[in-house]
Interface confidence: medium
């Protein structure tokens, strides 16, 4: 074991903001820390104060402009500190050369809606939020529906290999409520992991007609 | 996958110096963070400086402050920690690492050991 084992994770959105979590076993809960970044070849440094979010991590979000503004590009390196208060000074606790388009981790997709509903299937759409217009159409999407008597995690997972803001979810059960949740992933990056799960949108399927199915 | 090998290490006597090295072959070394470890007999193995790709170093531990120096040459794959006035408390295996960032292993990021260099201070 490494003493005072520590991880220091952080994601761009691919605009504006990156987000990091700092943790550090043994670490006093009163610490003052924050994430200071400083890109290589950009006139502006950002900081943001780590503030607890369990008993030995912290995180805060390095916001680097207005939400849809493109502030970092595919060769910007920032170099990323965590920085923590030890009396008088500041001491560099983590440091990383972070490259943002390896790093990447969207918003959650927004504004779902039920474009159409039948007995037995319901088409959804919704939006990617605050996106680069770098990847064009190199995004991916999972979706996952809620059933009456089941969790989130038993829901199997619907993949969408393309940009595609829209599924038809087909063989549902007449007269019955679902809910519906939708993430996105850029292609790009070594590092580039999943979005939040979106709000969940819950929907209700039409009942039967009385002597027939349609 | 990348390869971490660490000389330099020896025997010296208090307050004397020694020059480590860390020679990395494998994936684009200037992408890395690198740092030393060291492990002293019977005791945790404990964080000492990282330097990233663009030379960017944390700060070290107040026992070591003023004495350690941590460098990098991108052009030969290596990094190095000069030690002078060496104290017998230095006594230790020091390993070479290697990830995204250091002291850190990020989620779902590898750290890289070397296999380590004995240095041993005698009073």
């Known amino acids: 074991a490494v003493n005072g084992t520590s991880q220091f994770t952080c994601f761009y959105n691919s605009r504006a903001n990156i987000s990091c979590v700092w943790s550090q076993d043994g670490a006093l809960q009163d610490t003052s820390c924050q994430v200071h970044a400083w890109p290589d070849r950009r006139r502006w440094n950002q900081t943001c104060e780590l503030l607890p979010v369990s008993q030995a991590s912290w995180a805060c979000n390095l916001i680097l402009g207005a939400p849809d503004s493109q502030k970092l590009t595919t060769v910007d390196i920032v170099t990323l500190r965590v920085l923590c208060r030890e009396g008088v000074r500041w001491r560099v606790m983590a440091i990383q050369d972070f490259k943002p388009f390896e790093n990447l981790r969207l918003m959650a997709p927004i504004s779902l809606q039920v474009v159409h509903v039948e007995t037995h299937r319901c088409n959804i759409s919704w939006e990617i939020s605050q996106a680069s217009h770098y990847f064009e159409r190199h995004l991916e999407f999972e979706a996952r529906t809620l059933s009456p008597g089941h969790t989130w995690e038993e829901a199997p997972l619907l993949t969408l290999k393309q940009k595609q803001e829209w599924i038809c979810l087909e063989t549902l059960t007449p007269d019955t409520q679902y809910e519906f949740q939708v993430r996105v992933k850029p292609l790009q990056g070594e590092f580039t992991t999943w979005s939040p799960w979106s709000q969940p949108l819950a929907f209700r399927t039409k009942p039967a007609a009385l002597g027939k199915d349609t | 996958e990348v390869q971490l090998v660490e000389s330099g290490g020896g025997s010296v006597q208090a307050g004397g110096s020694l020059r480590l090295s860390c020679a990395a072959s494998g994936r684009t070394f200037s992408d890395y963070t690198m740092g030393w470890f060291r492990q002293a007999p019977g005791k945790e193995r404990e964080f000492v400086v990282a330097?990233?790709?663009?030379?960017?170093?944390?700060d070290m531990p107040d026992s070591v402050e003023g004495r350690f120096t941590i460098s990098r040459d991108n052009a030969k794959n290596t990094i190095y920690l000069d030690m002078k006035n060496l104290k017998p408390g230095d006594t230790a295996v020091y390993y070479c690492?290697?990830?995204?960032?250091?002291?850190?292993?990020?989620?779902?990021?590898?750290?890289?050991w070397g296999e380590g260099t004995l240095v041993t201070v005698s009073s």
């Open positions: 690492a290697s990830a995204r960032g250091l002291p850190v292993t990020p989620l779902g990021d590898i750290i890289y």
């Open positions: 330097i990233t790709g663009t030379g960017h170093t944390t």
